[in-house]
């Protein structure tokens, strides 16, 4: 997250970190069910761990943390690497979470976002771009949903209805390491960090997010079919 600020503790209990060995964060994710996460499909890896209820990026033990293995990864069937359409994936955890103030699911919004909607994006991604700089703790950033026309103008021929753009003033954006993390609008999960300009946070180049309102049926049916 570029030019965000430290999230208040306990305010993002659905935020997950996907870790490669040894405790190397590579993507964010979102708890949407006691045993299921949503993340970006481009975050797919064979072997990874999931950390929930953790505030700092470092692997130091926190009393609220819960660790899991991802036992099943189900990318959306319309996703094709390395494209960005249909960029979402469900991950089944090896067990159900223990609900606490630090770990609980969020509902996926069934309403598509309208321009001007205020949202919050969070993650442990780099705080500088194009060089990489790790934050100490989870970062939060207020962003506004842009109209689909402004989105398409910013990224000609790259935007479809499985994406939406959101941003703020130049110099504020999601970035590397935030992929798969949540965009929360009006208390519901509206999007996942997917892509954006390179380097991040360029003027008139908003972040691009997976438009989850288009996928509520697939999410529900996939969880039911694999539970």
């Amino acid at each position: 997250i570029i030019n965000g600020s430290d999230c208040d503790m306990h305010t993002q209990p659905w935020q997950a970190a996907l870790l490669l060995r040894p405790n190397q964060l590579y993507c964010g994710a979102v708890l949407v069910h006691p045993q299921w996460l949503l993340t970006a499909a481009h975050c797919r890896k064979k072997v990874f761990r999931v950390r929930l209820g953790h505030y700092s990026l470092s692997p130091v033990y926190e009393s609220g943390q819960q660790m899991f293995q991802g036992v099943k990864s189900i990318p959306h069937p319309g996703y094709s690497h390395p494209g960005h359409s249909n960029d979402l994936m469900l991950i089944k955890l090896n067990r159900r979470i223990r609900p606490t103030k630090d770990v609980r699911p969020i509902n996926v919004s069934s309403h598509c976002p309208s321009a001007g909607t205020k949202c919050l994006v969070s993650g442990w991604g780099t705080t500088k771009s194009p060089q990489v700089h790790f934050p100490k703790v989870l970062q939060c950033l207020n962003i506004s949903v842009l109209s689909q026309k402004r989105c398409e103008d910013a990224y000609p021929r790259q935007i479809d209805d499985t994406m939406f753009c959101a941003g703020d003033k130049a110099g504020r954006d999601s970035c590397q390491g935030d992929s798969g993390g949540p965009v929360v609008c009006n208390g519901s999960l509206q999007g996942l960090v997917s892509w954006g300009d390179y380097p991040c946070a360029r003027p008139n180049r908003p972040g691009v997010y997976t438009n989850l309102c288009k996928f509520t049926k697939w999410i529900q049916e996939t969880i039911q079919a694999n539970s």
């Epitope: 590579y26 999601s174 590397q176 954006g196 300009d197 390179y198």
Partner: antibody, heavy 124, light 107 residues
Framework: QLQLQESGPGLVKPSETLSLTCTVS??????????WSWIRQPPGKGLEWIGN???????YYNPSLKSRVTISVDTSKNQFSLKLSSVTAADTAVYYC????????????????WGQGTTVTVSS | EIVLTQSPGTLSLSPGERATLSCRAS???????LAWYQQKPGQAPRLLIY???SRATGIPDRFSGSGSGTDFTLTISRLEPEDFAVYYC????????FGGGTKVEIK
């Protein structure tokens, strides 16, 4: 299958501007999934990264070359270009263009497709 | 600027032997941002390993990468005749840079 082909003059005079073009075939530059790079290799030496460009035109340059480098993209021609000003004999090298994958995960996918390289000699 | 130092400069080995190449960074580099390339005379570099340990498409499993922080290693478990080449590490954590290379030559 994606292919990259560098082209441009093989001989440039000192103090002039070196101009090279990389033509992409079998794939499209206007893709949000990739960035495009220039790398060079002086005779008998190692590789030096020059800079990257995204399809949108956003660039990222090697700090040591930044004052002399311009990388641009022409999506209609499926090409990207390098200009290096005020060249000296030290800029004599094989110049490569390459492609790298890009997303917002904490991950560097490496540069997976390279051109065969073009030799540029700086001499009067 | 992160400087990558590769050692040894030259490695003289016979086919079938194991090759261990080192890449040391002047400051800590996320392992996710480290790649290895192979270059043969007159050819462009070829991506072998990305993310310090993941093999690129079509790369044989005798090539493996490991390491974290400032120390990274490329291992070729059993050298084949076509493996004799120059190998470069690259980091993209800071402004991208390459190591000076290690030449693997036939003993």
């Amino acid at each position: 299958q994606l292919q990259l082909q560098e082209s441009g003059p093989g001989l440039v005079k000192p103090s002039e501007t070196l101009s090279l073009t990389c033509t992409v075939s079998g794939g499209s530059i206007p893709s949000s999934s990739y960035y495009w790079s220039w790398i060079r290799q002086p005779p008998g030496k190692g590789l030096e990264w020059i800079g990257n460009i995204y399809y949108s035109g956003s660039t990222y340059y090697n700090p040591s070359l930044k004052s002399r480098v311009t990388i641009s993209v022409d999506t209609s021609k499926n090409q990207f270009s390098l200009k290096l000003s005020s060249v000296t004999a030290a800029d004599t090298a094989v110049y490569y263009c390459a492609r790298g994958e890009y997303d917002r995960s904490y991950y560097f996918w490496g540069m997976d497709v390279w051109g065969q390289g073009t030799t540029v000699t700086v001499s009067s | 600027e992160i400087v990558l130092t590769q050692s040894p400069g030259t490695l003289s080995l016979s086919p079938g032997e194991r090759a261990t190449l080192s890449c040391r960074a002047s400051q800590s580099v996320s392992s996710s941002y480290l790649a290895w390339y192979q270059q043969k005379p007159g050819q462009a570099p070829r991506l072998l390993i990305y993310g310090a340990s993941s093999r690129a498409t079509g790369i044989p499993d005798r090539f493996s990468g490991s390491g974290s922080g400032t120390d990274f290693t490329l291992t070729i478990s059993r050298l084949e005749p076509e493996d004799f080449a120059v190998y470069y590490c690259q980091q993209a954590f800071s402004s991208p840079s390459f190591g000076g290379g290690t030449k693997v030559e036939i003993k």
